[in-house]
Amino acid sequence: LIIGFGISGRHSITVTTVASAGNIGEDGILSCTFEPDIKLSDIVIQWLKEGVLGLVHEFKEGKDELSEQDEMFRGRTAVFADQVIVGNASLRLKNVQLTDAGTYKCYIITSKGKGNANLEYKTGAFSMPEVNVDYNASSETLRCEAPRWFPQPTVVWASQVDQGANFSEVSNTSFELNSENVTMKVVSVLYNVTINNTYSCMIENDIAKATGDIKVTESEIKRRSHLQLLNSKAS
């Protein structure tokens, strides 16, 4: 969480941003809130990206003002216009690109004053893993697959029964480049699996951490997975 003032002079308002990550090819949100104003026409929102010539987005007098927008963001940005009046200046970024990573500034002007806060935005690819029993294998084997990751993640297996055990000798992980030549499909195979045990396939890079669990008993198979974005700090 980053809370910014940083405006010289007397009248400053509080602006708050949250560091976040974007999944390339999907839509992302750059979060920013501020002390609201009574009149929408008095609110100006400017989004800037450090090092970029034009603005990322500008909203003033109740509508988008995109004449100064940098071409790398053309047609890809929107604020939540109906929520500006209550202090939401968050930006929706469509079709996130790797090059969208960087430091952004949410700059607010209202009748009460001015304020800004910076936001670190990371970009990459992350997806939920699915763990299945590989019935084609000669021994009891688990197969963990996740369709899109970037940068290349690490894959670690763990088990509930053998806590702390190192499965690197009995597992094999491969990364297959997807058709767009950036993201990769992650496949990890775990051999010599025992029944009545819960196994976890943990995939992690500097943007996200995802876990796929599987519990194999003689009567059923239970699966669960979750994904967590790393470094979501507010400013």
């Epitope: 400017q46 800037l48 450090e50």
Partner: antibody, heavy 117, light 107 residues
């Protein structure tokens, strides 16, 4: 430490050419638009040219358009200014500057270009 | 092109004085205005960006205000190291343009 270091200045005759370099260090050069700004002896600041972070856009002051070319080599973290058909009025200290939040936030120490016969 | 007019072109002041420099744009530039300080033989240094945002490491005695066409740089209490030339610069459209400068001298 974030740093910009210009080189390549010197004495050149009118109509001659010169290439200025600006070596960047301490930051991710490829993420920033970069500018050249000049200052004639005893005069104010004059913006010369800019190149976008990815090199796709370049803009020039009217006074140098068609004669100067701005370029960058991200693999070498270096900005360039190729100056052709130099005139006496191009005599100045040339600064490279990083584009931060809509401003020149980091400047080099400058390199002197003298155009004289 | 957008013309930037700074006034005064020079001023004499004493340590501790409050100093105000103004900058006028020939057309509306919103808040897209920056202020720089330059000392003899040195490169300029960014003080204020986006009209009123203080650049990191710049003392809080410097402040900027204004929007549209009229802008002000204020030094609340002039220090010996503040004697220099100050420039405003518009950042809304190419070509980027600077004001003519204001030289702050010791009285």
């Amino acid at each position: 430490e974030v740093q910009l270091l210009e080189s390549g200045g010197g004495l050149v005759k009118p109509g001659g050419s010169l290439r200025l370099s600006c070596a960047a260090s301490g930051f991710t050069f490829s993420s920033y638009a970069m500018h050249w700004v000049r200052q004639a002896p005893g005069k104010g600041l004059e913006w010369v040219a800019v190149i976008s972070y990815d090199g796709s856009n370049k803009y020039y002051a009217d006074s140098v358009k068609g004669r100067f070319t701005i370029s960058r080599d991200d693999s070498k973290n270096t900005l360039y200014l190729q100056m052709n058909s130099l005139k006496t009025e191009d005599t100045a200290v040339y600064y490279c500057a990083r584009h931060g939040w809509d401003a020149f936030d980091i400047w080099g120490q400058g390199t002197l270009v003298t155009v004289s016969s | 092109d957008i013309q930037m007019t700074q006034s005064p072109s020079s001023l004499s002041a004493s340590v501790g004085d409050r100093v105000t420099i103004t900058c006028r744009a020939s057309q509306d530039i919103s808040n897209r205005l920056n202020w720089y300080q330059q000392k003899p033989g040195k490169a300029p240094k960014l003080l204020i960006y986006l009209a009123s945002s203080l650049q990191g490491g710049v003392p809080s005695r410097f402040s900027g205000s204004g929007s549209g066409t009229d802008f002000t740089l204020t030094i609340s209490s002039l220090q010996p190291e503040d004697f220099a030339t100050y420039y405003c610069q518009q950042a809304i459209s190419f070509p980027l343009t600077f004001g003519g400068g204001t030289k702050v001298e010791i009285k």
